[in-house]
């Protein structure tokens, strides 16, 4: 004998791996924020399968995703945000897997935008800003920022540069001139908030001047 | 229900170190972030840092960096903290909380003196 | 660091009143503070998180408000049992920062 229920979906569903993560955005939409759960096995057949979430909850015991394609998803006021939420994946009202999440340790900040890059001729230098919608936000508002940058020719050469504020300086000299140069920029929570890296900004592209061969030094663009 | 267990009052000498301990009851000890906090007498509360039971992870006040050391011991759901070089300065209650600061230790005094 | 500013050392009530006690940050910290009561020889006791979220068992007498930089806690209808050191606290950026604390006292 194998061992194994030959009698029925749900016994062999058993066998499956439902393992999952989750990851959370705080006042992703106004005040609304939102939770965002997917099985770490893509092949998992999830046509019977819910996701809810209970406890640490304002009002209600418990929440059920909805399901859109192959990740599950909750917009809701209704995080208390303190303490641990227990997040089950479920078949009918059987729980196959649950975890105990406390939902402001796996927040996934909004990615940043409006990344740019300006040369500074006299300065000799890049300056290069973007912008994060946290600034405005009520809870996550302190981040560690991740800008990395290549040389365009360079397929996985990035440089990476950690730092908190929205603005930093590129030394002229530490680039290859006359290059085209993509640089992108992406965040993660830092201090009490913790959590996972948001996704890239769009990346911006730019070049460097071209070396002035009579001073040594590159031409403005 | 949750209880943090805190040690005894500690009486020691100025350049000596000391070891307090938390001892968690009532929950999953590692999954839960640990703090530390000072309380002068009479006077407010300063955070000294904090340990992440799971892996040991820390992070500091950097007031606090040079003077405090955290450990855990998972086996024995205990969070440790070392002080050193103590000084009058270092006299105050030491309370341990966890990271929601829903539940705190009774606080354990110590007192610097020669 | 913040700095959490209360600029009542202490304050003067009786029984039945209405009190306000105020706290300013030195930055935005949007609504992560918390707020707490302290009686003497005991641990603090966490009352309102979020700036105004009543933790569980807090009497609703208490309210909390405020965001950014300015912060209240309300005591309507203050009890014997309500004298005691309030302190409020900034947690969104390391380090975490407390106010010096505000005692209330019977008038």
């Known amino acids: 004998e194998s061992g194994y229920a030959q009698n029925g979906d749900l016994e062999d569903a058993e066998l499956d791996d439902y393992s999952f993560s989750c990851y959370s955005q705080l006042e992703v939409n106004g005040s609304q924020h939102s939770l965002t759960c997917a099985f770490e096995d893509p092949d998992v057949n999830i046509t019977n399968l819910e996701f809810e979430i209970c406890g640490a909850l304002v009002e209600v015991k418990c929440l059920n995703f909805r399901k859109l394609q192959e990740i599950y998803f909750i917009e809701t006021k209704k995080f208390l945000l303190i303490g641990k939420s227990n997040i089950c994946v479920k078949v009918g009202e059987k729980s196959l897997t649950c975890k105990k999440i406390d939902l402001t340790t796996i927040v996934k900040p909004e990615a940043p935008f409006d990344l740019s890059v300006v040369y500074r001729e006299g300065a000799n230098d890049f300056v290069v800003t973007f912008n994060t919608s946290h600034l405005q936000k009520k809870y996550v508002k302190v981040l560690m920022h991740d800008v990395a940058y290549r040389q365009e020719k360079d397929e996985n050469k990035w440089t990476h540069v950690n730092l908190s504020s929205t603005k930093l300086t590129l030394l002229q000299r530490k680039l290859q001139p006359a290059a085209m140069y993509e640089i992108k920029v992406r965040s993660i929570p830092d201090h009490y908030f913790k959590g996972f890296w948001s996704e890239w900004s769009p990346s911006y592209y730019f070049r460097t001047p071209e070396i002035n061969n009579s001073s040594g030094e590159m031409d403005p663009i | 229900q949750v209880q943090l267990q805190q040690s005894g009052a500690e009486l020691v000498k100025p350049g000596a170190s000391v070891k307090l301990s938390c001892k968690a009851s009532?929950?999953?000890?590692?999954?839960?972030?640990m703090y530390w906090v000072k309380q002068r007498p009479g006077q407010g509360l300063e955070w000294i840092g904090e340990?992440?039971?799971?892996?040991?992870?820390?992070n500091f006040n950097e007031k606090f960096k040079s003077k405090a050391t955290l450990t855990v011991d998972k086996s024995s759901s205990t969070a440790y903290m070392q002080l050193s070089s103590l000084t009058s300065e270092d006299s105050a209650v030491y309370y341990c909380?966890?990271?929601?600061?829903?539940?705190w230790g009774q606080g354990t005094l110590v007192t610097v003196s020669a | 660091d913040i700095v959490m500013t209360q600029s009542h050392k202490f304050m003067s009530t009786s029984v039945g009143d209405r009190v306000s006690i105020t706290c300013k940050a030195s930055?935005?910290?949007?609504?992560?503070v918390a707020w707490y009561q302290q009686k003497p020889g005991q641990s603090p006791k966490l009352l309102i998180y979020?700036?105004?979220t009543r933790h569980t068992g807090v009497p609703d007498r208490f309210t909390g408000s405020g965001s950014g930089t300015d912060f209240t806690l309300t005591i309507s209808n203050v009890q014997s049992e309500d004298l005691a050191d309030y302190f409020c606290?900034?947690?969104?950026?390391?380090?975490?920062?407390f106010g010096a604390g505000t005692k209330l006292e019977l008038r």
């Open positions: 979020w700036a105004s």
């Open positions: 009532g929950y999953t000890f590692t999954n839960y972030y």
């Open positions: 930055q935005d910290v949007g609504i992560v």
């Open positions: 606290q900034q947690y969104s950026s390391y380090p975490l920062t």
């Open positions: 909380t966890r990271r929601s600061f829903a539940y």
């Open positions: 340990i992440n039971p799971s892996n040991g992870g820390t």
